[in-house]
Structure formats: structure tokens, C-alpha cells
């Protein structure tokens, strides 16, 4: 009789463990669902605002082909300019072609005139090679015209229709670039 009671007690305990496990799985599943729901809501919100706005670029950004550009209204050193762009989901301008350079310089002429604007180009201190922020090399026609004599880090900037170089710690305006939103229509 005692053995029978002991067996029943063990079975009950096993059942309880299984129920606890099931409850734990359910809680985990519920948490996972809530998390997915959050992502879905965020995605829907973004999609709705994009659909409502339907503009490929945010307000105050300029569009050209697949890119959106933002011309800053504040001065900063190159590294801070880079951070300012990242805060808006963009990077400092990376000029891929003469056509893009012409568009940028043409737009700047209309907006502000002949100022200095940091772009995402910097010179490697060891090799002296110019590289864009993503690690790619500029095309031969898009290398800074003058080599800065600075002992400090050297970065690229646009002025009028030229690409020039300067100590990265000098203060300039800057240009950010991000991908334009593709229309789903």
C-alpha cells in the first residue's frame, strides 16, 4: 500500500514538473510573440508613415537618383560630422562619379555658395592612400587636388567644384548621404 502511494506521489510530481515546463514554454512563447508584435508594429508604423509621406527622402534632404543628401547648417570637425550623419542613419558623402560630383557642386551653388563641406574621404596615415569611409578607393578623377602638409590626420572636403584636403580637426560644414527609399509601386 505504501509503495502504491509512493508511486502515485512520484507520478503526481512528474506531472507537476511537466506542467511547470509547459507553463515555462508558454511564457517564453508569449514573450516571443510580444516581441514579434513589437517588431510588427514598428514595421507597420514605418511602412504607414512612409506610405503617407511617400517621399524617397526625408524633409530638408535633396534627392539625386538612388541617394538623399543633407547639407548641414552647422560647422563641426570631421569626426563629429561623421557622428552627426550616423545619428540620422546616413554617412558622410561618398562621391562615386563625376555626375554625382557635378550634382553636388551644382546644388551647393544654389543653396549656399562657396563654403567648405566635409565628405567621407580620409587619408591613411601610414600608406598615404585616400579611402572612402566604407574602405573603397576613390576613382582617379576624384582625388583631392592638393596634398595637405598637416602632420595631423587629413580629410577630404568639397569647395566650389573641387575636392580638397585639410586637417580633420578644422571646422567645416558637412554633407550626409543615405539611400533613397524605393517606391514599392
Amino acid at each position: 500500500k505504501l509503495l502504491q502511494v509512493s508511486t502515485i506521489a512520484m507520478q503526481q510530481q512528474e506531472k507537476l514538473i511537466q506542467q511547470e515546463r509547459a507553463l515555462l514554454n508558454f511564457t517564453e512563447w508569449k514573450r516571443s510573440c510580444a516581441l514579434q508584435m513589437k517588431y510588427c508594429q514598428a514595421f507597420m508604423q514605418n511602412s504607414l508613415s512612409s506610405a503617407h509621406n511617400s517621399s524617397p527622402c526625408p524633409n530638408n534632404w535633396i534627392q539625386n537618383r538612388e541617394s538623399c543628401y543633407y547639407v548641414s547648417e552647422i560647422w563641426s570637425i570631421w569626426h563629429t560630422s561623421q557622428e552627426n550623419c550616423l545619428k540620422e542613419g546616413s554617412t558622410l558623402l561618398q562621391i562615386e562619379s563625376k555626375e554625382e560630383m557635378d550634382f553636388i557642386t551644382g546644388s551647393l551653388r544654389k543653396i549656399k555658395g562657396s563654403y567648405d563641406y566635409w565628405v567621407g574621404l580620409s587619408q591613411d596615415g601610414h600608406s598615404g592612400r585616400w579611402l572612402w569611409q566604407d574602405g573603397s578607393s576613390p576613382s582617379p578623377g576624384l582625388l583631392p587636388a592638393e596634398r595637405s602638409q598637416s602632420a595631423n590626420q587629413v580629410c577630404g572636403y568639397v569647395k566650389s567644384n573641387s575636392l580638397l584636403s585639410s586637417n580633420c580637426s578644422t571646422w567645416k560644414y558637412f554633407i550626409c548621404e543615405k539611400y533613397a527609399l524605393r517606391s514599392s509601386v
Epitope: 514598428a42 545619428k87 540620422e88 542613419g89 546616413s90 569611409q133 566604407d134 543615405k178
Partner: nanobody, 115 residues
Framework: QVQLQESGGGLVQAGGSLRLSCAAS????????MGWYRQAPGKQRELVAA???????SYADSVKGRFTISRDNAESTVALQMNSLKPEDTAVYSC?????????WGQGTQVTVSS
Amino acid sequence: QVQLQESGGGLVQAGGSLRLSCAASGSITSINAMGWYRQAPGKQRELVAAITSGGRLSYADSVKGRFTISRDNAESTVALQMNSLKPEDTAVYSCAAFQSSGIDWGQGTQVTVSS
């Protein structure tokens, strides 16, 4: 406010590799870009690599060609694959989340490269 949790730091021989990971939680929908900073003793904090939600990349000159940043937007995670490590890469590496309102940083993870 975004909370960031780094993992993957440690001690490695020069020429070796390490992979750092960072998971974001909290106000993740406000994140426009994620990245990694590092700070060596007595030196200024520097941005090592960053990736925007649109996939645009940014690397410090000193790591170009050696480090690769990647991001999983759905999971709100960012990883930094570090190859051909040098003693001068020794630093505390901190994950960063860039939002219009500012930058949030993680606690950091120590990376030590021995020669």
C-alpha cells in the same frame, strides 16, 4: 533610452581574430545606426566602425581591410569581425546606438592583443 550588451572580448595573439557581438534592447525603433568605439588607456575614444539601418558602412582608417561590421536589423544586433589583430588594437570596445536624439553606449568589453 537604448540598452546595449556586448560580448566576445578577450585575449588574443597578434595576427589572430576575434568577433564582438552587441545586442540592443529598449527603444530599438529609434536606432538609425549602430557601431563600435574603442578607447585605449590614455587615448581618446575613437569610432572604429558603424553601419546604418540602410546598410551604409563607415570604418576608421586604421581598421580598413581588417575589420568587418555587420548588423541584423530584425534582431537589433551588431557584430564586429576583427582579423589580423595588432597590439595597437588593444582597448575597451564599446557598442554604440545612434539616434537623432544622441548616442547610447554599452559598458564595453576588453580586447587585449599580445605580441
